[in-house]
Amino acid sequence: LTCLGGFASPGPVPPSTALRELIEELVNITQNQKAPLCNGSMVWSINLTAGMYCAALESLINVSGCSAIEKTQRMLSGFCPHKVSAGQFSSLHVRDTKIEVAQFVKDLLLHLKKLFREGQFN
């Protein structure tokens, strides 16, 4: 994590690049998973609709002691227009449903791949 994704060239990059890098990180997490991800920690499920980046971070920021998802948290923080705090919940959370972080990541990955295919980069 030391170089935090490497150094990008100056100036804005296409939104597709940011989404692609997030997808690549989620793929890395799912493929490199040996033991249960984040020791099987549970997080609130979210509605994968508009505002899902903030909702996803609001769920994942409550997971501590799990270095595997730190880079994902950092990426997501930039997709959400406001600062997200632990313990903060939006209306996009399915508050009665908790799932394992591993399943959360898989669901998010599938949805982001769909958005990427459809060209919905923002």
């Epitope: 994590l1 935090l4 990008a8 940011a18 501590s64 002691g65 730190e70 923080s77 930039g78 997709f79």
Partner: antibody
Framework: EVKLVESGGGLVRPGGSLKLSCAAS????????MNWVRQTPEKRLEWVAS???????YYSDSVKGRFTISRDNARNTLHLQMSSLRSEDTAMYYC???????????WGQGTSVTVSS | DIVMSQSPSSLAVSVGEKVTMSCKSS????????????LAWYQQKPGQSPKLLIY???TRESGVPDRFTGSGSGTDFTLTISSVKAEDLAVYYC?????????FGSGTKLEIK
């Protein structure tokens, strides 16, 4: 209300040791990266060390091998064990929240460390 | 390490004037994975701890007056105070949190005439 309170500073001789602590309250401590930052007598700010919510640890080259950062999530406390202290470690030491997802949004009032014979 | 350079080192202005200060980094601070510049501005008033003003180069921290504006991208950044108040007397530091080790500029001291 987020609060960070440092303690443990003081006067120590070169080569000596000191342990700083930072008591955190008002937020979910375990979910945040935490940092130690020092301010030299010349008022320069120097990042010292970070410990992420996931347990990753980072040090500045100037303290690597001499300082150890740790956290006790059960007690909401951040620590900095300093050994082999040098005169150039003389500074005000602050603990600060986050720095990884966002910038360092909350700082303590600082604790003063003086290394002198 | 990323070197942060601030200028000027100090400036004196009258209340109501507009102030701009510069911060340059030796490496790009734009993280391609989310298109954010990992650059922060802090204000340190005499006898106090640093206080976060701006993060992501241009996002004001909650509670910070809108006379403070951060701008820039890549390696060149600016903090602007649109109309200085007496209470803005402080040292202003920029800091990169793009990669470890985090590094700070040497500060710009704002004095009131």
């Amino acid at each position: 209300e987020v609060k960070l309170v440092e303690s443990g500073g003081g006067l120590v001789r070169p080569g000596g040791s000191l342990k700083l602590s930072c008591a955190a309250s008002g937020f979910t401590f375990s979910s945040y990266a935490m940092n130690w930052v020092r301010q030299t007598p010349e008022k320069r700010l120097e990042w010292v060390a970070s410990i992420s919510s996931g347990g990753n640890i980072y040090y500045s080259d100037s303290v690597k091998g001499r300082f150890t950062i740790s956290r006790d999530n059960a007690r909401n406390t951040l620590h900095l064990q300093m050994s082999s202290l040098r005169s150039e470690d003389t500074a005000m030491y602050y603990c600060a929240r986050d720095g990884y997802l966002y910038a360092m949004d909350y700082w303590g009032q600082g604790t003063s460390v003086t290394v002198s014979s | 390490d990323i070197v942060m350079s601030q200028s000027p080192s100090s400036l004196a202005v009258s209340v109501g004037e507009k102030v701009t200060m510069s911060c340059k980094s030796s490496q790009n601070l734009l993280y391609s994975s989310n298109q954010k510049n990992y650059l922060a501005w802090y204000q340190q008033k005499p006898g106090q701890s640093p206080k976060l003003l701006i993060y992501w180069a241009s996002t004001r921290e909650s509670g910070v007056p809108d006379r403070f504006t951060g701008s820039g991208s890549g390696t060149d950044f600016t903090l602007t105070i649109s109309s200085v108040k007496a209470e803005d007397l402080a040292v202003y530091y920029c800091q990169q949190y793009y990669s470890y080790p985090f590094t700070f500029g040497s500060g710009t001291k704002l004095e009131i005439k």
